[in-house]
């Protein structure tokens, strides 16, 4: 009957943890004798290729200064005490303790068995490290530049994480990689970049994060701060200003990042009806007369700079009924 | 790089225990098995015995209760209990590779009894 | 007990080549290694795994096994191979460990 080595054509292990590489003989033969078990790494150097070795009566020797014993060993392989104790080699399953990037390669687990001669079979090792992702809004000031808004890093990644955003904004991705401190590991930044403007503050944008160490991608929402000058409106006009009017109010409505500084209401006729009177960022007219027939400017100023918006009034004689009882009812 | 040395070969009237040591250089006794072989003059090698990595000793049939080896985390000795002259022999240390091949020797240490 | 034989000498022209044999009186369960060894020198690793060659052994060196017969083959033999050679193998057949050497071949380049 012919034996195999059952191995797994790839194991996956994390930098600075402990591995398995699973290797049994099967099927359990009667009379088969096992003089031997090697672990070799065949693409290393030639004095480092045996890295491990078990004979059924010497036991476990580890023959490459690298791993070596302290970081190796053998799971299940027991040797042969004396006239009493068969060794038990057919699981030759070895350990593998604090993963080094320098682990990673081919490894292949051999038996030299009698009368059936060598039979092996290889497993690939792969080291991998779980990367740490932060993401951050960066405090841009409006601009008609392209600037980065925000930044997504996954830090230490084996194999080098990928970084994807979400956002319905008009935006680009420039990504850069580097080392990470721990040897073999990557660094991965993403810039979030667009032309910062008042319409993107408060957006929240994603990070998507993927890496084959987690189960599903890590998403990490990021709020963007961008500094613009006020945006402003003005609401309150009904197109039924009328002479005599004494409820009227003009609201100015500001988009702001930082928070207005200061109102200011103005004309451009120059001339400021004294029935109106400015109170922050509302314009209260006690009476409407006939100065109003002009346009109504207000000019707000945050630490970035100004905004304006103007209103034309349009004063009547009496009021416009036209449409009053078709809004009302 | 890794070296082996062999000291304490000189020397002795029969019957006088004989302590010979080997002085390894990078290596870690802790993953090697470590054999003694000695050659006598004019003649073959022939093995003596070993000691594993985990510090189990196995030893030649005709060296049984004649040596004794053991070692420290730098050293690996030899003790000639009661040497007869047939015991006169350059004395090798040697390392066992995966496959159990002695793949690094000392240059030998010289042993003489004589009355 | 496990016994290698080994033809106390043999010689070679130099250039040639020769082949050295090494046979056990039982069929062995373990690999065979190869050592050269020259006057006042520790013996040198040759071969190992019955057909490996360690680093920095020239391949002119080469190693074969059938049986219970371990060859080590010389081509283009050369005046600096004139040296002892022993086969071993280790032998776990009874409840002890043995490491077995061959009686040795006294190689001799002529020529």
């Known amino acids: 009957q012919d034996v195999r080595v059952q191995v797994l054509p790839e194991v996956r292990g994390q930098l600075g943890g402990t591995v398995e590489l699973p290797c049994h003989l099967l099927p359990p033969v009667p009379g088969l004798y096992i003089s031997l078990v090697t672990w070799q790494r065949p693409d290393a150097p030639a004095n480092h290729q045996n890295v491990a070795a078990f004979h059924p009566k010497m036991g476990p020797s580890f023959p490459s200064p690298k791993p070596g014993s302290e970081r190796l060993s053998f799971v299940s392989a027991k040797q042969s005490t004396g006239q009493d104790t068969e060794a038990e080699l057919q699981d030759a399953t070895l350990a593998l303790h604090g993963l080094t990037v320098e682990d990673e390669g081919n490894y292949t687990c051999e038996f030299a068995t009698f009368p059936k001669g060598s039979v092996r079979g290889m497993t690939w090792l792969r080291v991998i490290a779980k990367p740490k992702n932060q993401a951050e809004a960066q405090k841009v000031t409006f601009s008609q530049d392209p600037t980065t808004v925000a930044l997504c890093i996954s830090k230490e990644g084996r194999p080098p994480a990928r970084i994807s955003w979400l956002s319905s904004l008009d935006w680009e991705a420039k990504e850069t990689q580097v080392s990470g401190t721990l040897a073999g590991t990557v660094t991965v930044t993403s810039r979030f970049t667009l032309v910062p403007s008042g319409r993107a503050d408060g957006v929240t944008v994603t990070c998507k994060v993927e890496h084959e160490s987690f189960e599903e991608p890590a998403l990490i929402p990021v709020t963007l701060s961008v500094r613009y000058p006020p945006e402003v409106s003005i609401s309150g006009y009904d197109d039924n200003w009328y002479l005599g009017r004494t409820d009227a109010t003009l609201s100015c409505d500001v988009r702001s990042n930082p928070e207005p500084t200061g109102y200011d209401w103005s004309t451009t006729s120059g001339t400021f009806p004294t029935s109106a009177v400015a109170q922050g960022s509302q314009l209260v007219i006690h009476a409407v007369d006939s100065l109003f027939n002009t346009t109504f400017v207000c000019t707000v100023t945050n630490a970035v700079g100004m905004g304006r918006a103007e209103q034309v009034i349009f004063v009547r004689e009496t009021p416009n009924t036209a449409g009053a009882g078709a809004t009302g009812g | 790089a890794q070296s082996l040395e062999e000291s304490g070969g000189r020397l002795v009237t029969p019957g006088t225990p004989l302590t010979l040591t080997c002085t390894v250089s990078?290596?870690?006794?802790?993953?090697?098995?470590m054999n003694w072989v000695r050659q006598a003059p004019g003649k073959g090698l022939e093995w003596i015995g070993i000691i594993g990595a985990s510090a189990g000793t196995y030893y030649a049939r005709w060296a049984k209760g004649r040596f004794t080896i053991s070692k420290t985390s730098t050293t690996v000795d030899l003790k000639i209990t009661s040497p007869t002259t047939e015991d006169t022999a350059t004395y090798f240390c040697?390392?066992?590779?995966?496959?159990?091949?002695?793949?690094?020797w000392g240059p030998g240490t010289l042993v003489t009894i004589s009355s | 007990s496990f016994v290698l034989t080994q033809p106390a000498s043999v010689q070679v022209n130099l250039g040639q080549t020769v082949s050295l044999t090494c046979t056990a009186d039982?069929?062995?369960?373990?690999?065979a290694s190869w050592y050269q060894q020259k006057p006042g020198q520790a013996p040198v690793l040759l071969i190992y795994?019955?057909?490996s060659r360690p680093s920095g052994v020239p391949d002119r060196f080469s190693g074969s096994s059938s049986g219970n017969t371990a060859t080590l083959t010389i081509s283009g033999a050369q005046a600096g191979d004139e040296a002892d050679y022993y086969c071993?193998?280790?032998?776990?057949?009874?409840?002890?460990?043995?490491?077995?050497f061959g009686g040795g071949t006294q190689l001799t380049v002529t020529g």
């Open positions: 071993a193998t280790d032998d776990s057949s009874g409840s002890s460990y043995q490491y077995v």
């Open positions: 795994r019955d057909t």
């Open positions: 990078g290596i870690d006794l802790s993953s090697y098995h």
């Open positions: 039982t069929l062995s369960r373990s690999y």
């Open positions: 040697a390392r066992s590779g995966g496959s159990m091949q002695l793949n690094l």
